[in-house]
Interface confidence: medium
């Protein structure tokens, strides 16, 4: 790719595409990023991340006016984390019940852990190209949060947009709408 | 330099099928879009829609849904336009079309040399 | 759709003369990216359009620098300072900010 012609994506949340009919990949295919948990040989105060899942993502992606050549392959962090003492009887009463409503006031949710940065080249309906620099996630973990954190911020640790590379008079400016897309 | 070389004049009777190609040269050609124009006589022009060359994926203009299919062959570096069920509203001057490397929506710098599609009884 | 309206449909020219085409789109032509995708293309008779005018007002590598254009939001101008008698055809606005990408109808100019 052009490094002077690569423009940032500020989110790679963008309109999902449907794969090419000759394409064998997955979509969407979760799995529990190899999280296990056992009601065996640990003590009480041993806690197992239950919930957190990755699901693993394939998708073209389109900007609206262009559409990557190849599908993108990255993780979506979703669902709640359920950090729980391990004990038989950990799904209903019990210690169980007492445990959580001690620390109602704290959620454990499923956050991106590791991401990096690739460059996707995409072809566009004017028969010209464009190459984008986005942010995908490459791991998943459960972290910790009050229930004062303001609850609709869930981009927890997600990069920060860097700023956008200017080139050839192409003058860029994030948009309201650039959280999900750039058209 | 950039070419692309399309296929000669058709005449069609109505109901039957026309398939157009399209051959690029000059560039790598899946690494960019193929676009589609349609020019009836006397007439503006009209995009059609492109097909991601890499991936295959067509896209259409809502007007250009149903009877037009857009395809590749890759080894060859031809795309193609099939137009089936032919009416007479189909007869125009069909042209592949592709845009500047890097540099999106900065015009159509390339065309094809358009094919004559006549839909006659 | 954006359905991009131009004006005049004819347009007799003095040779050295100046000439002007407007063109105005149905809605804003300014990508959320700051960029305006409003492009001129000439085509001269039997022949495919070429490319003129890209993003309002950059010119394509090759153009004379007769040839302008101006404009923002919904109103654009391609203007040509001196008509020479190769610039006769059909010129072409179009617009690539919104899909589908669309086309004017078309403004014929011709030598008086």
């Known amino acids: 790719f052009k490094n002077d012609a690569t423009e940032i994506l500020y989110s790679h949340v963008v309109k999902p595409v449907p794969a090419h009919p000759s394409s064998n990949s997955t979509l969407n295919q979760a799995r529990n990023g190899g999280r296990h948990f056992s009601n065996t040989g640990l003590d009480r105060n041993t806690r197992v991340q239950v919930g957190c899942r990755e699901l693993r993502s394939t998708k073209y992606i389109s900007d609206g006016q262009c559409t990557s050549i190849s599908p993108l392959k990255e993780l979506v962090c979703a669902g709640e984390c359920l950090p729980l003492p391990v004990l038989p009887n950990w799904i209903g009463g019990g210690y169980g019940t007492k445990y959580w409503s001690r620390r109602s006031s704290q959620e454990w949710r499923c956050v991106n852990d590791k991401t990096r940065t690739q460059r996707i080249q995409l072809q566009c309906q004017d028969g010209s190209t464009r190459t984008y620099k986005i942010t995908v996630v490459t791991a998943c973990k459960c972290k910790r949060y009050t229930r004062q954190h303001n609850e609709s911020s869930h981009n927890f640790e997600s990069m920060s947009p860097a700023k956008p590379v200017q080139h050839h008079r192409e003058r860029k400016r994030a948009s309201k709408s650039s959280k999900h897309s750039m058209s | 330099q950039v070419q692309l070389v399309q296929s000669g004049a058709e005449v069609k009777k109505p109901g039957a099928s026309v398939k157009v190609s399209c051959k690029a040269s000059g560039y790598t050609f899946t690494t960019y879009g193929m676009s589609w124009v349609k020019q009836a006589p006397g007439q503006g022009l009209e995009w059609m829609g492109w097909i991601n060359t890499y991936s295959g994926v067509p896209t259409y203009a809502d007007d250009f849904k149903g009877r037009f299919v857009f395809s590749l062959d890759t080894s060859v570096s031809t795309a193609y336009l099939q137009i089936n069920s032919l009416k007479a509203e189909d007869t125009a001057v069909y042209f592949c079309?592709?845009?500047?490397?890097?540099?999106?929506?900065?015009?159509?710098?390339?065309w094809g040399q358009g094919t004559l599609v006549t839909v006659s009884s | 759709d954006v359905v991009m309206t131009q004006s005049p449909l004819s347009l007799p020219v003095t040779l050295g003369q100046p000439a002007s085409i407007s063109c105005r789109s149905s809605?804003?032509?300014?990508?959320?990216?700051?960029?305006?995708?409003l492009h001129w293309y000439l085509q001269k008779p039997g022949q495919s359009p070429q490319l003129l005018i890209y993003k309002v007002s950059n010119r394509f590598s090759g153009v004379p620098d007769r040839f302008s254009g101006s404009g923002s939001g919904t109103d654009f101008t391609l203007k040509i300072s001196r008509v020479e008698a190769e610039d006769v055809g059909v010129y072409f606005c179009s617009q690539s900010t919104h899909v589908p990408l669309t086309f004017g109808g078309g403004t014929k100019v011709e030598i008086k």
């Open positions: 079309v592709r845009g500047r490397e890097y540099y999106y929506g900065s015009g159509i710098a390339f």
């Open positions: 809605q804003s032509l300014e990508h959320s990216n700051g960029n305006t995708y």
